[in-house]
C-alpha cells in the first residue's frame, strides 16, 4: 500500500549490522509523486566500488547510487549526510554485507517522503500538446479557445469530424481554410451518396497547401481519402500531388485530415459529385452489346447477344442471348454468363455406317460419316461431311440435320463366279459369288435377299408353309452348318395376289405370278457372304433378249443327289419361250396342253444339260445389270420346268417390280423409313 | 489323265518347318475344292485342311490349327501346305485329295512321307 | 469334335461271304457319310457317298445304308480284290473326320 513517508534501518541499527546480510526494502509511494530519499546517518564498510558491503538504490533499472563508508553533514543545520529525488512513485533499497567485517560498523539510517513532480516541466517528453498545468500529485492538460481536449486527455484538437455529407454534389475544406488549419488534429469527413453513384472528388493544385513531408518522404499533416478497400494519398506538400479528378467506384468517402503539432498551412478544398456508376465496357468475346454506348453507368441494360455459333449456358439451358445491368456496385449483373461455341454434342450413330470420334463437337467442327463399305453405301447422298451450325445441331449441305442412311449395295459379289463344266447341268459354287441366296429349309428351296428387311422367293415355295425358317451366309446346307450361318425369321410372307392357290399343289399345271416376298422380322447385317441383289429396272434396258446369260445357284438336285451339300451355280442363256413348251413333261401330272405358259416367264437352259431343278426354286436367275456391268440384279426366280437338265422357266421379276417396291412400302418399319 | 503328285516331304527337327506341294494335271484344277489328309506309318486316315476353289475359304484340322497354312495356285494348277513348329505327332503321309463335289474325294495323290525327329 | 467309331477294328471272311462293317457318330451327321478302300501302299478310293450311293465304276457288291448316327457298309460277296482297309468318313462339320478303319482279310 503506498505511503507518503517512511524510515528505513540497516539490520540491528544502532548496532553493528552482521555480516553476510542481504535485504532489499520497496519504497512505493501515491501517483503522482515523486520519493525524497535522505540519510541522516551512514556508517558501512568501506571498499573499492562498494564491493564488500553497500547501500544500493534503484528507480526501475536504474542504479541510483551505491553508498558505503562514513558520511557525516555538510550543513550544520541539517542532519542528511546523503539524498535522492526521484520523479517516480516506486524506489528499492538493497543493503548487503560481506562474510566479515574489520572493525564494528553500524549501518544507516534513511528516510523517505512523497513530493510533488511537475509534471509540465520534470520530463523531457511534454504531457500535454498545449497548456500544461500542475498541482500536487499531478496535472492537467487545457487547450485554447475553439479547441477541445480529445479522450486521451493530453491532446487538443479542432471539433472537425463527424460531418456526413449525403448531396450529390458538394464542397468540403479544411478547418478555418484559407488560414491556417489547427495543429494536432484529425478531421474526418464522411461522404455518403445513394448507391449506384460513385464519388468523384475534384480539386485544383492551388487549393492545397499541407505541410511538407520530412526527409524520408513521410507526410508531417496529410489528407486521405479511403473508398472502402481502396485508399487514395496520404498527401501532403504546396499544390496537390494527387490526380484533380479521383473517381473513388465508391458511393462512400471518408476522408481524413491529420495534423501535427507543427508547421501550419492554408490547408485545402475541394468539391465533389456524385456520378452514376460506371461499369466497365467488358470485352465479352463472340458476343454484340446493344445498344453500344462507349460508356455503361448506373441502371443502364445491355442485350448481349451470341454470334452464331455460340451460346449462353446456364445449367442445362442454351440461349442465343441475355440481358446485363449496370449494378449499384459498377459490376454487370450475370457477368458470369460467358458465349461459348456451341456444343453439338456426340454425334449420333447411324446404322451400318460410322462416324469417327471427332476431336471437338464445337461449333465449326467436321464429322464424317462412312458406310461399312463395300456392304452399304450412303443412299441420301450428301457426302457424309456434317459441320457443327450455329444452331447446335449437325448439319450437312445438301441433308441439313437429317442423318446419312447407309443401305446395301445390291448385286455385287464379293468373289465373281467362274463357271466350269466339270459337273453335267453346273459347278461348285462359294456363298461369295451369290450372296444374296437364301436357302430355305422346308421346303427345300432358295430364294433372294433383295435388301435388309425382305426376301424375294417363288410363291410356290411359300404357299404351303408360311412360316418358313431360312439361312444365309454358308456355302453348306449341313445342319452344323447352318447352325453357324445366319438363320432368317419370317414376320410374314405376301404371296402375289394373282398366284393361284390350288387344295392339291402337286397337280399344280399353272406356274403364273410364281413370286412371293417374305418379310423379315430383324434387318439382315450385309458382308462378304450375305448382300442382296438387285431388283430390274424398270426401262426397256431390263427387257431379256434370247441368248442374253444368267446365273442360277442353289442347293437343289444334281445328277448325283437329290439334294446338293455346296451350293451349285451354273451360267444359262434365255431361251424363247417356245423351246420350254417343245420339252416333253417329265412325270407330268396332266395333259401337256394344260401347262400354262405366259409372258410372266422367262425360258433358259437348254445349254449343255445345264438346268435348275427340284429344290431350287425361289433362287434368282442373275443377270447383269446393262447400265452397271459390276453388279446383278434378279431377272428370274426358279419357278417350274418339264424336265430338269433341259429348259426351266423362270419368274420374270421386271414384270412384277411395281408389286415389289408397293409391297415394301406399304410393310416398312419406321426404323426403315 | 487325273494326276495329284505330291512334293516337299523328308526329314526334319521338330520345331522346323517344311513345305508340300501338289501338282494337278488332267483336270481344271480351280474347279475343284482340295484337301491334305494324313496317315501316320500303321494308323489310320486324318483329315488335315481344306480350301475353296478360290482360295478364300480354309479350315484347318485342330491338331495343326496356327501351325500349317492351306493355299493354292490356281494359274500353276498346284496346292500348298506350309508347315510350321513341326512336332513328332506330325510324322505322316501327306495326301492331297480332289473334292469332286460335297465332300467326296474321289482323287488322291500316291502321298509324301514327312518325318519328323531329332 | 464329332467321333466315328468304325467296328469291328478287322475281320477274316472267306471268298463269297457277306461282309458288313459298321460306323456309329457321336452325333447326328444326317446322311453326310463317303466309305473309302485303301489297299496296301495306295491311296484311299471314294466307294460310296451320301451314306447309300454308289460311285460310279464301284462294282455292284459295295452298298451303303443308315442315317443319322448309325451306318452299315456290305460287300454281299467278297471278293480276293477286296482286301483292304475300309474308313468310313463324316463331312457334316468340321473338322472332317474318318473311322479308325476296318482290316479285310481272307480266310
Known amino acids: 500500500e503506498p505511503t507518503m513517508y517512511g524510515e528505513i534501518l540497516s539490520p540491528n541499527y544502532p548496532q553493528a549490522y552482521p555480516s553476510e546480510v542481504e535485504k532489499s526494502w520497496d519504497i512505493e509511494v501515491p501517483e503522482g509523486y515523486g520519493i525524497h530519499l535522505y540519510f541522516t546517518h551512514l556508517d558501512i564498510e568501506l571498499s573499492e566500488n562498494c564491493a564488500y558491503d553497500s547501500v544500493q538504490i534503484i528507480s526501475g533499472d536504474t542504479e541510483e547510487g551505491r553508498l558505503c563508508g562514513q558520511r557525516s553533514s555538510n550543513n550544520p543545520h541539517s542532519p542528511i549526510v546523503e539524498e535522492f529525488q526521484v520523479p517516480y512513485n516506486k524506489l528499492q533499497v538493497i543493503f548487503k554485507s560481506d562474510f566479515s567485517n574489520e572493525e564494528r560498523f553500524t549501518g544507516f539510517a534513511a528516510y523517505y517522503v512523497a513530493t510533488d513532480i511537475n509534471e509540465c516541466t520534470d520530463f523531457v517528453d511534454v504531457p500535454c500538446s498545449h497548456f500544461c498545468n500542475n498541482f500536487i500529485g499531478g496535472y492537467f492538460c487545457s487547450c485554447p479557445p475553439e479547441y477541445f481536449l480529445h479522450d486521451d486527455m493530453k491532446n487538443c484538437g479542432v471539433n472537425c469530424s463527424g460531418d456526413v455529407f449525403t448531396a450529390l454534389i458538394g464542397e468540403i475544406a479544411s478547418p478555418n481554410y484559407p488560414k491556417p488549419y489547427p495543429e494536432n488534429s484529425r478531421c474526418e469527413y464522411q461522404i455518403r451518396l445513394e448507391k449506384g453513384f460513385q464519388v468523384v472528388v475534384t480539386l485544383r493544385r492551388e487549393d492545397f497547401d499541407v505541410e511538407a513531408a520530412d526527409s524520408a518522404g513521410n507526410c508531417l499533416d496529410s489528407l486521405v481519402f479511403v473508398a472502402g478497400d481502396r485508399q487514395f494519398g496520404p498527401y501532403c506538400g504546396h499544390g496537390f500531388p494527387g490526380p484533380l479528378n479521383i473517381e473513388t467506384k465508391s458511393n462512400a468517402l471518408d476522408i481524413i485530415f491529420q495534423t501535427d503539432l507543427t508547421g501550419q498551412k492554408k490547408g485545402w478544398k475541394l468539391r465533389y459529385h456524385g456520378d452514376p456508376m460506371p461499369c466497365p465496357k467488358e470485352d465479352t468475346p463472340n458476343s454484340v452489346w446493344e445498344p453500344a454506348k462507349a460508356k455503361y453507368v448506373f441502371r443502364d441494360v445491355v442485350q448481349i447477344t451470341c454470334l452464331d455459333g455460340f451460346e449462353v449456358v446456364e445449367g442445362r439451358v442454351g440461349a442465343t442471348s441475355f440481358y446485363s445491368t449496370c449494378q449499384s456496385n459498377g459490376k454487370w449483373s450475370n457477368s458470369k454468363l460467358k458465349c461459348q461455341p456451341v456444343d453439338c454434342g456426340i454425334p449420333e450413330s447411324i446404322e451400318n455406317g460410322k462416324v469417327e470420334d471427332p476431336e471437338s463437337t464445337l461449333f465449326g467442327s467436321v464429322i464424317r460419316y462412312t458406310c461399312e463399305e463395300p456392304y452399304y453405301y450412303m443412299e441420301n447422298g450428301g457426302g457424309g461431311e456434317y459441320h457443327c451450325a450455329g444452331n447446335g445441331s449437325w448439319v450437312n449441305e445438301v441433308l441439313g440435320p437429317e442423318l446419312p442412311k447407309c443401305v446395301p449395295v445390291c448385286g455385287v459379289p464379293r468373289e465373281p463366279f467362274e463357271e466350269k463344266q466339270r459337273i453335267i447341268g453346273g459347278s461348285d459354287a462359294d456363298i461369295k459369288n451369290f450372296p444374296w441366296q437364301v436357302f430355305f429349309d422346308n421346303p427345300w428351296a432358295g430364294g433372294a435377299l433383295i435388301n435388309e428387311y425382305w426376301v424375294l422367293t417363288a410363291a410356290h415355295v411359300v404357299e404351303g408353309n408360311r412360316e418358313p425358317t431360312m439361312y444365309v451366309g454358308s456355302t453348306s446346307v449341313q445342319t452344323s452348318r447352318l447352325a453357324k450361318s445366319k438363320m432368317l425369321t419370317p414376320e410374314h410372307v405376301f404371296i402375289h395376289p394373282g398366284w393361284k392357290l390350288l387344295e392339291v399343289p402337286e397337280g399344280r399345271t399353272n406356274f403364273d405370278n410364281d413370286i412371293a416376298l417374305v418379310r423379315l422380322k430383324d434387318p439382315v447385317k450385309m458382308g462378304p457372304t450375305v448382300s442382296p441383289i438387285c431388283l430390274p429396272g424398270t426401262s426397256s434396258d431390263y427387257n431379256l433378249m434370247d441368248g442374253d446369260l444368267g446365273l442360277i445357284s442353289g442347293w437343289g438336285r444334281t445328277e448325283k443327289r437329290d439334294r446338293a451339300v455346296r451350293l451349285k451355280a451354273a451360267r444359262l442363256p434365255v431361251a424363247p419361250l417356245r423351246k420350254c413348251k417343245e420339252v416333253k413333261v417329265e412325270k407330268p401330272t396332266a395333259d401337256a396342253e394344260a401347262y400354262v405358259f405366259t409372258p410372266n416367264m422367262i425360258c433358259a437352259g437348254g445349254e449343255k444339260g445345264m438346268d435348275s431343278c427340284k429344290g431350287d426354286s425361289g433362287g434368282a436367275f442373275a443377270v447383269q445389270d446393262p447400265n452397271d456391268k459390276t453388279k446383278f440384279y434378279a431377272a428370274g426366280l426358279v419357278s417350274w420346268g418339264p424336265q430338269c437338265g433341259t429348259y426351266g422357266l423362270y419368274t420374270r421379276v421386271k414384270n412384277y417390280v411395281d408389286w415389289i417396291m408397293k409391297t415394301m412400302q406399304e410393310n416398312s418399319t419406321p426404323r426403315e423409313d | 489323265e487325273v494326276q495329284l503328285v505330291e512334293s516337299g516331304g523328308g526329314l526334319v527337327k521338330p520345331g522346323g518347318s517344311l513345305r508340300l506341294s501338289c501338282a494337278a494335271s488332267?483336270?481344271?484344277?480351280?474347279?475343284?475344292?482340295m484337301s491334305w489328309i494324313r496317315q501316320a506309318p500303321g494308323k489310320g486316315l486324318e483329315w488335315v485342311s481344306y480350301?475353296?476353289?478360290?482360295?478364300?475359304?480354309?479350315y484347318y484340322a485342330h491338331s495343326v490349327k496356327g501351325r500349317f497354312t492351306i493355299s493354292r495356285d490356281n494359274a500353276k494348277n498346284s496346292l500348298y501346305l506350309q508347315m510350321n513348329s513341326l512336332r513328332a505327332e506330325d510324322t505322316a503321309v501327306y495326301y492331297c485329295?480332289?473334292?469332286?463335289?460335297?465332300?467326296?474325294?474321289?482323287?488322291w495323290g500316291q502321298g509324301t512321307l514327312v518325318t519328323v525327329s531329332s | 469334335d464329332i467321333q466315328m467309331t468304325q467296328s469291328p477294328s478287322s475281320l477274316s471272311a472267306s471268298v463269297g461271304d457277306r461282309v458288313t462293317i459298321t460306323c456309329q457318330a457321336s452325333?447326328?451327321?444326317?446322311?453326310?457319310l463317303n466309305w473309302y478302300q485303301q489297299k496296301p501302299g495306295k491311296a484311299p478310293k471314294l466307294l460310296i457317298y451320301?451314306?447309300?450311293n454308289l460311285e460310279t465304276g464301284v462294282p455292284s457288291r459295295f452298298s451303303g445304308s443308315g442315317s443319322g448316327t448309325d451306318f452299315t457298309f456290305t460287300i454281299s460277296s467278297l471278293q480276293p480284290e477286296d482286301i483292304a482297309t475300309y474308313y468310313c468318313?463324316?463331312?457334316?462339320?468340321?473338322?472332317?473326320?474318318f473311322g479308325g478303319g476296318t482290316k479285310v482279310e481272307i480266310k
Open positions: 480350301i475353296s476353289r478360290s482360295g478364300s475359304t480354309k
Open positions: 468318313h463324316q463331312y457334316e462339320d468340321y473338322p472332317l473326320t
Open positions: 488332267g483336270f481344271t484344277f480351280s474347279d475343284y475344292y
Open positions: 485329295a480332289r473334292d469332286e463335289t460335297d465332300y467326296a474325294y474321289d482323287e
Open positions: 452325333q447326328d451327321i444326317s446322311n453326310y
Open positions: 451320301d451314306a447309300s
